[in-house]
């Protein structure tokens, strides 16, 4: 059994999240994940899910009673989602830490917008896919 | 020329983001995007970038002078990043709107954590990759 399982059970106790009533009114993440089978679609959704957990864990970083559990889970997320690639993890964290209310950040984001948009679709990266998409776009 | 280009130029004027000094101290997104060639890695990063822009645009939704530009760009993001798939866009928006300070959301997130973790690595989806990874993990 992966070590994260024991630590996640510990977090369930701490957050009082083991009760069946927690599942009322549907799921947060599991239902959405079930909708997407393509790896790239899954990564779009998982990226948001992982950043949610990182934010959640950050809010409880000073709570000693769950620190070991949180760090074990974060490490396993690093292994599983980022394939233990520190650069991938660091780039991800940079993106999640940008403040949307910072004026300099806003200006930079708008300054980069055209180039970001040009790279958004997979088509932008491969001529072959671009051509095949053109047929459907008229 | 894609319609978003003209509208992005309009936003550059509004945000005073056309000046060369905006590029000082490096880029927000472009440098990071340059690091990742694999489609699934790019989606991890682009997911955060797109959610940043959506948040930014939300903050300016009542500003009439840029409303048309914002709507055009959001529509083009929808086409390019979500491939005009409304369900994909809706699921994404749901994930970005969860509040990390809402106690019910916290409990649900912790309740689902074990299953989310089990699905995080591509290996979890394909037996073949899982076996090959086991060799390295001891």
């Amino acid at each position: 059994q992966d070590p994260y399982v024991k630590e996640a059970e510990n977090l369930k106790k701490y957050f009082n999240a083991g009760h069946s009533d927690v599942a009322d009114n549907g799921t947060l993440f599991l239902g959405i994940l079930k909708n997407w089978k393509e790896e790239s679609d899954r990564k779009i959704m998982q990226s948001q899910i992982v950043s949610f957990y990182f934010k959640l864990f950050k809010n409880f970083k000073d709570d000693q009673s769950i620190q070991k559990s949180v760090e074990t889970i974060k490490e396993d997320m690093n292994v599983k989602f980022f394939n233990s690639n520190k650069k991938k993890r660091d780039d991800f964290e940079k993106l999640t830490n940008y403040s949307v209310t910072d004026l300099n950040v806003q200006r930079k984001a708008i300054h980069e917008l055209i180039q970001v948009m040009a790279e958004l679709s997979p088509a932008a990266k491969t001529g072959k896919r671009k051509r095949s998409q053109m047929l459907f776009r008229g | 020329q894609d319609p978003y280009v003209k509208e992005a130029e309009n936003l550059k004027k509004y945000f005073n983001a056309g000046h060369s000094d905006v590029a000082d101290n490096g880029t927000l997104f472009l440098g990071i995007l340059k690091n990742w060639k694999e489609e699934s890695d790019r989606k991890i990063m682009q997911s955060q970038i797109v959610s940043f822009y959506f948040k930014l645009f939300k903050n300016f939704k009542d500003d009439q002078s840029i409303q048309k530009s914002v709507e055009t760009i959001k529509e083009d993001m929808n086409v390019k990043f979500f491939n005009s798939n409304k369900k994909k866009r809706d699921d994404f928006e749901k994930l970005t709107n969860y509040s990390v300070t809402d106690l019910n959301v916290q409990r649900k997130a912790i309740h689902e954590l074990i299953q989310v973790m089990a699905e995080l690595s591509p290996a979890a989806k394909t037996g073949k990759r899982k076996r090959s990874q086991m060799l390295f993990r001891g």
Partner: antibody, heavy 124, light 111 residues
Framework: EVQLVESGGGLVKPGGSLRLSCAAS????????MHWVRQAPGKGLEWVSS????????YYADSLKGRFLISRDNDRDSLYLEMNSLGVEDTAIYFC?????????????????WGQGTLVTVSS | NFMLTQPHSVSESPGKTITISCTRG????????VQWYQQRPGGVPKIVVF?????PSGVPDRISGSIDTSTNSASLTISGLQTEDEADYYC??????????FGGGTKLTVL
Amino acid sequence: EVQLVESGGGLVKPGGSLRLSCAASGFPFSRYSMHWVRQAPGKGLEWVSSMTSRTNHKYYADSLKGRFLISRDNDRDSLYLEMNSLGVEDTAIYFCARGYDTSGSDSGVDFQYWGQGTLVTVSS
Amino acid sequence: NFMLTQPHSVSESPGKTITISCTRGRGYIASYYVQWYQQRPGGVPKIVVFEDTQRPSGVPDRISGSIDTSTNSASLTISGLQTEDEADYYCQSYDDANHVIFGGGTKLTVL
């Protein structure tokens, strides 16, 4: 001050076994991944194995063909390398090196700290 | 194979500048951090550049690291060469199975 001290090296016959140890001090050992790297006489550095800090993920160089086993004891601040079916090609200085904090809190730098190494000689 | 290829040796006079290249054979150089180590004869490897371009404290700013995506390579540059720079230099990165990979090493001789 961060310190890594390897021990357990020595002379062993082909086919024999050895267990190397690395005693760590000066940092919270249980938070950092750890590595073993070796260097044959007059040759370059060769990575041997790595292990994460809390989740027991282990990684090995393909060339080892399952003969080596990495482990750690976080209570004793120690890293180990169990080496079996040793051949003359395994003769080298074996270094222990500290990795980074894979949970991301105060992450640190991979391979920033190295021990002095312990010499393993495989000869008949 | 995820080989990192370095020149076997380089030599230059004191005060000059040298660059040691480290070319990645498979995989994209920018997607994994690159580190550089200095190893003097009989000594322990010492990190001189980490995470592509960063210098640990105590390493002089004459030493710098860079990445060139067009050649899929990393470089270590040492300016104002000094006799104490004479050593073996190793680049190091990772592969997609989270294996650590080292370059073959470059012997730097200060003439």
